[in-house]
């Protein structure tokens, strides 16, 4: 018979003959033959492979090094990585993890309309009109501007996105 | 700084257990298995098992299975080891040491000698 | 069990001295590490993943081998290498050490 020019899902071609990738968790040590199988190798501790594979060494666990802001979010296995996010108050700088940063604080005028988390930056927004933010934060939203007239009371200075309305007494009409 | 202390040099009795901690600071023990290895006077190394402090999961070597029992405490990030049915050749120092991560290398205790005498 | 085989149990070196130890396992394994130890103290992990430096370890310690067959080098012996080396499995359980070899000064 012809000899293939393509294999199925899970094979590799080698030799003019189709061989089973090794699974998950494990590595290669030989191929195929006419007569024997793929031979394949489980990873060690510390170590992974996370698809079918012709790999003659697994991948070492990642390390989440807390000199960089790194904890383990999750230990890897023999299939798969070890995942690291940020401690609290940080985030990671790109999609791979490998370092963090501070969160970002929404300046005064601004308010969180995201709280970051272990992966995403704080998302701030411009306070409306009618609402205010005098603080530097990472977790204060805009608050809104305090209402006089439910207090029975007029207001004295007008608010901005910085400041909170001064409320003081009404005038009253003289007899 | 990271560090593994390990609990102070015992005396014991054959028949009785033993049961030795290793403190872990400078990491978080869940992140980690934590092996156990035993050093003979004058011999060399032996595994005797290990235990992933996140689960309880525990691998023994089958010549101390049933004698040997691993625990771990991650809100002391502590974890312990305890042998039973002690017998002369249990005489040794034993250590606590950590998995590898590049970046690492694994971490030792400073050991812990049992000594088993009547 | 895989049984691991370090030979010589024991050697005599000079300074300057390039050294051969080798471990043998008896299946074939992932990796093996390489520890170092002093009469007295924790053993010293001194290569990972068969032929990985750890950190501060001088590069006259090399590792290789695959397989069952597993070496360690040093190419110019110091007087801090006076030691016991041993070869570990991690691959399979129970995880197993050598037996250790001992380099001794001439």
């Known amino acids: 018979p012809e000899p293939p020019t393509a294999c199925r899902e899970k094979q590799y071609l080698i030799n003019s003959q189709c061989c089973s990738l090794c699974q998950p968790g494990q590595k290669l040590v030989s191929d195929c033959t006419e007569f024997t199988e793929t031979e394949c190798l489980p990873c060690g501790e510390s170590e992974f492979l996370d698809t079918w594979n012709r790999e003659t060494h697994c991948h070492q666990h990642k390390y989440c090094d807390p000199n960089l802001g790194l904890r383990v979010q999750q230990k890897g296995t023999s299939e798969t990585d070890t995942i690291c996010t940020c401690e609290e108050g940080w985030h990671c700088t790109s999609e791979a993890c490998e370092s963090c940063v501070l969160h970002r604080s929404c300046s005064p005028g601004f308010g969180v309309k995201q709280i970051a988390t272990g992966v995403s930056d704080t998302i701030c927004e411009p306070c409306p009109v009618g609402f205010f933010s005098n603080v530097s934060s990472a977790f204060e939203k805009c608050h809104p501007w305090t209402s006089c007239e439910t207090k029975d009371l007029v207001v004295q200075q007008a608010g901005t996105n910085k400041t909170d309305v001064v409320c003081g007494p009404q005038d009253r009409l003289r007899a | 700084e990271v560090q593994l202390v390990q609990s102070g040099a015992e005396v014991k009795k054959p028949g009785a257990t033993v049961k030795i901690s290793c403190k872990v600071s400078?990491?978080?023990?869940?992140?980690?298995?934590i092996h156990w290895v035993k050093q003979r006077p004058g011999k060399g190394l032996e595994w005797m098992g290990r235990?992933?402090?996140?689960?309880?999961?525990?691998k023994y070597d089958p010549k101390f299975q049933g004698r040997v029992t691993m625990t771990a405490d991650t809100s002391t990030d502590t974890a312990y080891m305890e042998l039973s049915s002690l017998r002369s050749e249990d005489t040794a120092v034993y250590y606590c040491?950590?998995?590898?991560?590049?970046?690492?290398?694994?971490?030792w205790g400073q050991g812990t000698t049992v000594t088993v005498s009547s | 069990d895989i049984q691991m085989t370090q030979s010589p149990s024991s050697l005599s070196a000079s300074v300057g001295d390039r050294v051969t130890i080798t471990c043998s396992a008896t299946?074939?394994?992932?990796?093996i590490l390489w520890f170092q130890q002093k009469p007295g103290k924790a053993p010293k992990l001194l290569i990972y993943?068969?032929?990985n430096l750890a950190s501060g370890v001088p590069s006259r310690f090399s590792g290789s081998g695959s397989g069952t067959d597993f070496t360690l080098t040093i190419s110019s012996l110091q007087p801090e290498d006076f030691a016991t080396y041993y070869c570990?499995?991690?691959?399979?359980?129970?995880?197993?050490f050598g037996g250790g070899t001992k380099v001794e000064i001439k």
């Open positions: 040491t950590t998995s590898y991560y590049v970046g690492t290398y694994g971490y």
């Open positions: 400078g990491f978080n023990i869940k992140d980690y298995y």
């Open positions: 235990i992933d402090p996140e689960d309880g999961d525990t």
């Open positions: 299946s074939s394994v992932s990796y």
């Open positions: 993943s068969t032929s």
């Open positions: 570990q499995q991690r691959t399979f359980y129970p995880y197993t």
